[in-house]
Each structure stands twice: as structure tokens, then as C-alpha cells.
Interface confidence: low
């Protein structure tokens, strides 16, 4: 499996580095995190992509003023966006 990888980037432009995953990795994972107050004010946004042995959390998670979206896929360089 190959996935795109990056850590805490502001834009997808910085998340286009392909990585050969370990044979323990079944998934490409994209973690999109943002902080703000509802949909009105956004304090920041970060994007991380990685290979992973599992899909960590199958649905989006909302924790107070922070929200995190996690998406998983299982094909060659599938975590493009």
C-alpha cells in the first residue's frame, strides 16, 4: 500500500508526498482538525495524512470548540484529498 503523508499542514498542497506503507498498514488515513466556535469563527485548521494499521475512528468527532474529521481508504494513494 502507498499513501500520501504529512503532519499538521495548513493546506493539501503540502500533503502530496507518497509514502510506502509498512506491511502492517491496511489503511490510508486523513485527519482534518479545526478549532472554532460553531461555523462562525475558525481559529485554525490542520491536515495530517498517514499510513495506519487500522481506521482509528470511523466517524467524525466533535469535542467542544474543536472538530476532527477522520477518513480512511484502502487503495493506492487514495487519501489524495
Amino acid at each position: 500500500l502507498m499513501c500520501f503523508s504529512c503532519l499538521n499542514q495548513k493546506s493539501n498542497l503540502y500533503c502530496l508526498k507518497p509514502t510506502i506503507c509498512s506491511d502492517q498498514d491496511n489503511y490510508c488515513v486523513t485527519v482534518s482538525a479545526s478549532a472554532g466556535i460553531g461555523n462562525l469563527v475558525t481559529f485554525g485548521h490542520s491536515l495530517s495524512k498517514t499510513c495506519s494499521p487500522a481506521c482509528p475512528i470511523p466517524e467524525g468527532v466533535n469535542v467542544g470548540v474543536a472538530s476532527m474529521g477522520i477518513s480512511c481508504c484502502q487503495s493506492f494513494l487514495c487519501n489524495f484529498s
Epitope: 509498512s22 502492517q24 498498514d25 491496511n26 494499521p53 487500522a54 482509528p56 475512528i57 470511523p58
Partner: antibody
Framework: AVQLVEFGGGLVQPKESLKISCAAS????????MHWVRQAPGKGLEWIAR??????????YYADSVKGRFTISRDDSKSMVYLQMDNLKTEDAAMYYC??????????????WGQGTLVTVSS | DIVMTQSPTSISISVGERVTMNCKAS??????VDWYQQKTGQSPELLIY???NRYTGVPGRFTGSGSGTDFTFTISNLQAEDLAVYYC????????FGAGTKVEIK
């Protein structure tokens, strides 16, 4: 909390078979590769088998010492992993641990361990 | 198979002192080395993963370093509860454990 509980160990004679089991709870079992690690009395740790998940066709991997004799399998509906041990040898006598990674931390390491089940092979 | 040569096999040291042990891989394993602690009669516990990352809840006195073929695990300010056997393990190609280092309290 994550829990792994092994059972099914016991005393068997050389060349006999035994199937041990591991019941998992506290995490999404179907998305995680599972492992068996053993430890002979007074000796070190030895990884022996791994089974991956359904999307990769439950791929299995074995240590050379057990290849062809041991078979790892899983039942995702029951959150169970098994180790079928055939043609047992005296050197297979050990504590058998079931182990799993903590994928929430993004580690592949053996973060979770059961208490072990003891397999004795003796005539 | 990759062989992990761990040294020393045992070490006797006083509480409060610093313990260092090493693991040498027979080939390059990158940073794919973990360290485990096993107390007598208990299951192993993960302390360090990917050579230098402390696992959740592990005290700061446990540290790991290294890459490629040479890895080091250190316990600074040894505590009585650290009496155990410590194993390195590579996960680069399948999985291989070192033979272990037994830490005894002097």
C-alpha cells in the same frame, strides 16, 4: 477498557494438536491485526503468528519455527482469534500470549497483551 | 531473519542510579524498534515504540534512542518497581525480540 483473554491451554503429548483462543473486547476488533507471542519457561519472548484484517483477505504470517504446523485464524463476529497447533513438539511448551496494537496512538507495537495461556507438551 | 542482539544479559544496580542497555540489529531496521518490560509472573508491557516514543502513561525516566542497527534504552533514576526483564523488538521485517536484559536491584 481493552481486554484480551486467552484460554484453551493444557497438557498434550508430542505430535498431538491443540487449539487455543483469545477473546478481545474494548476496541474495534475487526480493524486490527492480531498476534500470538509465546514464552517458553524461563526463556525470552518469541513472536509466532499474525493475522491481518478482512480488507487484506486475512493475510497470515508465521515465524519459521511454527510455519506449516500452526494456523492463526479469527472470527470478527465474535471478536476472537485462534491458534491451531498441530504436530506439537516439546519445544512448543510455553505461555502463549495474544497481543494487539493500539491503533489510536498510531503504533504498530504490541500495546495490549492478555494474561497468557500455558501449553505443556510432554509425554 | 533479523537477529536482535541485546546486551548486557543482566545488570545489578542501586535505586536512583542510571541503567543503560543496548540492542543491535543484524540489518538496518530503521526506527522500527520497541522496548518492553516484563515483571516476574506478568505479561509484557510496552514502554517505548518506534525507537524513541514513550508509550502512554510510561514514566519519563524511561527513554529510548537509536536508528538503523544500534539502539539504546535507558532508565534514569532507577526505582525498586523497575525490577524486571527488558526486551527490545524489531518490527521492520516480521518481529524479532532480543534475548532480554534482567535488571536486578543491588
Amino acid at each position: 477498557a481493552v481486554q484480551l483473554v486467552e484460554f484453551g491451554g493444557g497438557l498434550v503429548q508430542p505430535k498431538e494438536s491443540l487449539k487455543i483462543s483469545c477473546a478481545a473486547s474494548g476496541f474495534t476488533f475487526s480493524t486490527v491485526a492480531m498476534h500470538w507471542v509465546r514464552q517458553a519457561p524461563g526463556k525470552g519472548l518469541e513472536w509466532i503468528a499474525r493475522i491481518r484484517t478482512k480488507p487484506v483477505n486475512y493475510e497470515t504470517y508465521y515465524a519459521d519455527s511454527v510455519k506449516g504446523r500452526f494456523t492463526i485464524s479469527r472470527d470478527d463476529s465474535k471478536s476472537m482469534v485462534y491458534l491451531q497447533m498441530d504436530n506439537l513438539k516439546t519445544e512448543d511448551a510455553a505461555m502463549y500470549y495474544c497481543s494487539a496494537p493500539n491503533y489510536y496512538d498510531g503504533t504498530y507495537s504490541f500495546a495490549y497483551w492478555g494474561q497468557g495461556t500455558l501449553v505443556t507438551v510432554s509425554s | 531473519d533479523i537477529v536482535m542482539t541485546q546486551s548486557p544479559t543482566s545488570i545489578s544496580i542501586s535505586v536512583g542510579e542510571r541503567v543503560t542497555m543496548n540492542c543491535k540489529a543484524s540489518q538496518n531496521v530503521g526506527s522500527n524498534v520497541d522496548w518492553y518490560q516484563q515483571k516476574t509472573g506478568q505479561s509484557p508491557e510496552l514502554l517505548i515504540y518506534k525507537a524513541s516514543n514513550r508509550y502512554t502513561g510510561v514514566p519519563g525516566r524511561f527513554t529510548g534512542s537509536g536508528s538503523g542497527t544500534d539502539f539504546t534504552f535507558t532508565i534514569s533514576n532507577l526505582q525498586a518497581e523497575d525490577l524486571a526483564v527488558y526486551y527490545c523488538m524489531q518490527s521492520d521485517t516480521k518481529y524479532t525480540f532480543g534475548a532480554g536484559t534482567k535488571v536486578e536491584i543491588k
